[in-house]
């Protein structure tokens, strides 16, 4: 039975050019995670393996940066960086559990983060 | 060059409590999992205490659960380990030790800090 | 939980010989989904710390000598020191990092004659 949830950073907001930290944890299960995958829509950003550490995808290395910890750093972001974004958490003998965020990139000054939630 | 070093240890009494400390340095704290593994007189490794690098999770062996609680203080770089209702058999040296996030060994270890419980 | 099991308990060799010391789980280490035995190998040299020596089962930790080798898979692990030297005096101890909670085995004492 899965009983692990994953927390995450919510619904937030950044402004054009700058940058934000997308952030998951999983909690609740003793399940031991051996790989944790970033993906954009249905693009793979990036990759956190047990055995071989973190692998940006090429397509996004200049703007991708790894952590912290199991994070991921967007960097120079553009209003098409607007959309949801996914951590999916590989787990033994769990399985896979998967967490949502939502992050709007906003022209101006005003951008501010939204709250936590969680993803049973 | 990491280090790890332990302090807190001492004599206390059966049901007593007392708070081990390990101070972090030469890397980057924040970005480890980091866990408590103590060795008995007999020279047995028992790991007692886990926590992730940024503290929102913790596990412990049904042996000292309750009774443990691992915490840390990433802006101090220092990891601790409370421990209340002590008995004999928690008797022993206590490690902590740092692990890389998604490897649950550990590639680092501290030189230890001594607890005896007896009356 | 996992139950690990070292054999021999102690043993003595002479400089330069070669040694193997087995470790044994309960259940497999074996993670299907990647292929990884979750195994490590630690040496503990007298009045010190353990080090660690080898992960997933046989990859040598930076900066260990490359007499030691660790092998096997699922259920049976061996760790080899092909020559060894008096400074590897020490007791040898495997864990078991496939699931909670970690154990450990009871160690191999390696003497030298």
């Known amino acids: 039975m899965m009983t692990g949830t994953i927390e995450t950073t919510g619904n937030i907001s950044a402004e054009k050019g700058g940058s934000i930290i997308l952030q998951c944890h999983l909690s609740s299960t003793t399940a031991q995670v051996t790989q944790v995958n970033w993906e954009q829509q249905d693009q793979l950003l990036a990759i956190c393996n047990a055995d071989l550490g973190w692998h940006i995808s090429p397509s996004f290395k200049d703007r991708v940066a790894p952590g912290p910890g199991l994070g991921l750093t967007l960097q120079s972001l553009t209003v098409n960086d607007t959309g949801e974004y996914f951590c999916i958490y590989h787990t033994y003998p769990d399985g896979t559990y998967t967490g949502r965020i939502f992050l709007e990139v906003l022209e101006s000054s005003v951008a501010e983060h939204g709250a936590r939630f969680q993803i049973p | 060059e990491v280090q790890l070093v332990e302090s807190g240890g001492g004599l206390v009494k059966p049901g007593g409590s007392l708070k081990l400390s390990c101070a972090a340095s030469?890397?980057?704290?924040?970005?480890?999992?980091m866990s408590w593994v103590r060795q008995t007189p007999e020279k047995r490794l028992e790991w007692v205490a886990y926590i992730s690098d940024g503290g929102y999770n913790t596990y412990y062996p049904d042996t000292v659960k309750g009774r443990f609680t691992i915490s840390r203080d990433n802006a101090k770089n220092t990891l601790y380990l409370q421990m209340s209702s002590l008995k004999s058999e928690d008797t022993a040296i206590y490690y902590c030790?740092?692990?890389?996030?998604?490897?649950?060994?550990?590639?680092?270890w501290g030189q230890g800090t001594t607890l005896t419980v007896s009356s | 939980d996992i139950v690990m099991s070292q054999s021999p308990s102690s043993l003595a060799v002479s400089v330069g010989e070669k040694v193997t010391m087995t470790c044994k789980s309960s259940?497999?280490?074996?993670?299907?989904?990647?292929?990884?035995?979750?195994l490590a190998w630690y040496q503990q040299k007298p009045g010190q710390s353990p080090k660690l020596l080898i992960y997933w089962a046989s990859t040598r930790e930076s900066g260990v000598p490359d007499r030691f080798t660790g092998s096997g898979s699922g259920t049976d692990f061996t760790l080899t020191i092909s020559s060894v030297k008096a400074e590897d005096l020490a007791v040898y101890y495997c864990?078991?990092?496939?699931?909670?909670?970690?154990?450990f085995g009871g160690g191999t004492k390696l003497e030298i004659k």
């Open positions: 864990q078991q990092y496939h699931s909670y909670p970690w154990t």
């Open positions: 030790a740092r692990q890389i996030l998604l490897r649950y060994y550990f590639d680092y």
């Open positions: 030469g890397f980057a704290f924040s970005d480890y999992d």
């Open positions: 259940q497999s280490l074996l993670y299907s989904s990647n292929q990884k035995n979750y």
